[in-house]
Interface confidence: medium
């Protein structure tokens, strides 16, 4: 079965910067990746970035840079905008649409006791459906 993993890490150099890493483990080709925060895409979450292998990327503040790391993984750099540090207790979700498998989504967040530079372990648990 295809799986999606999500890692959230705080940058050691800039405490206000976070990076979300997501990857797809499975066969098939990826047609679209959607990163959202606050919940799954379409279920209360709001989009931060959309990455298309051919049409490029589209992102919204506070997302700073969305990019492909490999053919099946992406990273999204975020810039925390205020002292309240909303990223620290926020859920980030990545949805990979692949052909012919369908859509797979998984979520992750920064561990409560995270030291700068420490990332959450990969969580390859699909929390949503295969469309």
């Amino acid at each position: 079965t295809p799986e999606v993993w999500v890692q959230v890490q705080m940058e050691a150099t800039e405490l206000s910067s976070f990076t979300v890493h997501c990857g797809f483990l499975g066969p098939g080709s990826i047609s679209l990746v959607t990163v959202s925060w606050g919940g799954p895409d379409g279920a209360g979450g709001t989009k931060l970035a959309v990455l298309h292998p051919e049409l490029g990327t589209r992102q919204w503040a506070p997302a700073r840079q969305a990019r492909w790391e490999t053919q099946s993984s992406i990273s999204l750099a975020l810039e925390d905008s205020g002292a309240s540090s909303p990223f620290a207790n926020t859920t980030f979700c990545c949805k990979f649409a692949s052909f012919p498998e369908g859509s797979w989504e998984s979520c992750g967040s920064l561990p409560p006791s995270s030291d700068p530079g420490l990332s959450a372990p990969p969580t390859p648990v699909p929390i949503l459906r295969a469309d």
Partner: antibody
Framework: EVQLQQSGPELVKPGASVRISCKAS????????MHWVKQSHGKSLEWIGY????????GHNQNFKSKATLTVDKSSSTAYMEFRSLTSDDSAVYYC????????????WGQGTSVTVSS | DIQMTQSPASLSASVGETVTITCRTS??????LSWYQQKQGKSPQLLVY???TLTENVPSRFSGSGSGTQFSLKINSLQPEDFGSYYC?????????FGGGTKLEIK
């Protein structure tokens, strides 16, 4: 029925700050982004920024980053924008507007709050 | 940042006429464009989003078209209530920007 009710007009002195409120009703406040837009007299619209009430995360137009602070009070479903170090250039009507989470449309707007900066 | 060039800046037309307002963007924004109508002293009202999707309760005489960098809003058979200002806005990532506006006046 979705409604965004903004606070009343403000007359403020140069250098002062002002806080405008936008009370939302008729929908789940934390499920939608809240945007703020400026319109100077007789001019076009200028996007200031937005806040995601679910977690307080914000995004700004860089032109307003040091000028505007966006906050929310989830308990009262109210969004706030504080504008500081006001000058005559900040005299304008300010609107709040709800945006669906897909970033497709800003479908409901407040009635606007007029801010006049004058000594 | 994406620049929005809206034209014409002003337009005079008669009731019953058909008018077209255009919006050009500095970068490809695919279909991520909205059109708003604003009456004097009122808030903007969403007419069209995603370039061509009409908002609920907006009359069918309004239509949006275009993709990439060229967009247009067409109003068939102008009605008295259609006069006012019109703005385009992109939502292809932040910062969102608006066009300079088109003031539609009665001839």
């Amino acid at each position: 029925e979705v409604q965004l009710q903004q606070s009343g007009p403000e007359l403020v002195k140069p250098g002062a700050s002002v806080r405008i409120s936008c009370k939302a009703s008729g929908y789940t406040f934390t499920d939608y982004n809240m945007h703020w837009v400026k319109q100077s007299h007789g001019k076009s619209l200028e996007w200031i920024g937005y806040i995601y009430p679910y977690n307080g995360g914000t995004g700004h137009n860089q032109n307003f980053k040091s000028k505007a602070t966006l906050t929310v009070d989830k308990s009262s479903s109210t969004a706030y924008m504080e504008f500081r170090s006001l000058t005559s250039d900040d005299s304008a009507v300010y609107y709040c507007a709800r945006e669906d989470f897909r970033h497709e449309k800003m479908d409901y707007w407040g009635q606007g709050t007029s801010v006049t900066v004058s000594s | 940042d994406i620049q929005m060039t809206q034209s014409p800046a002003s337009l005079s037309a008669s009731v019953g006429e058909t008018v077209t307002i255009t919006c050009r963007t500095s970068d490809n924004i695919y279909v991520y464009l909205s059109w708003y109508q604003q009456k004097q002293g009122k808030s903007p009202q969403l007419l069209v989003y995603n370039a061509k999707t009409l908002t609920e309760n907006v009359p069918s005489r309004f239509s949006g078209s275009g993709s990439g960098t060229q967009f247009s809003l067409k109003i068939n058979s102008l009605q008295p209530e259609d006069f006012g200002s019109y703005y385009c806005q992109h939502h292809y990532g932040t910062p969102y920007t608006f066009g300079g506006g088109t003031k539609l006046e009665i001839k």
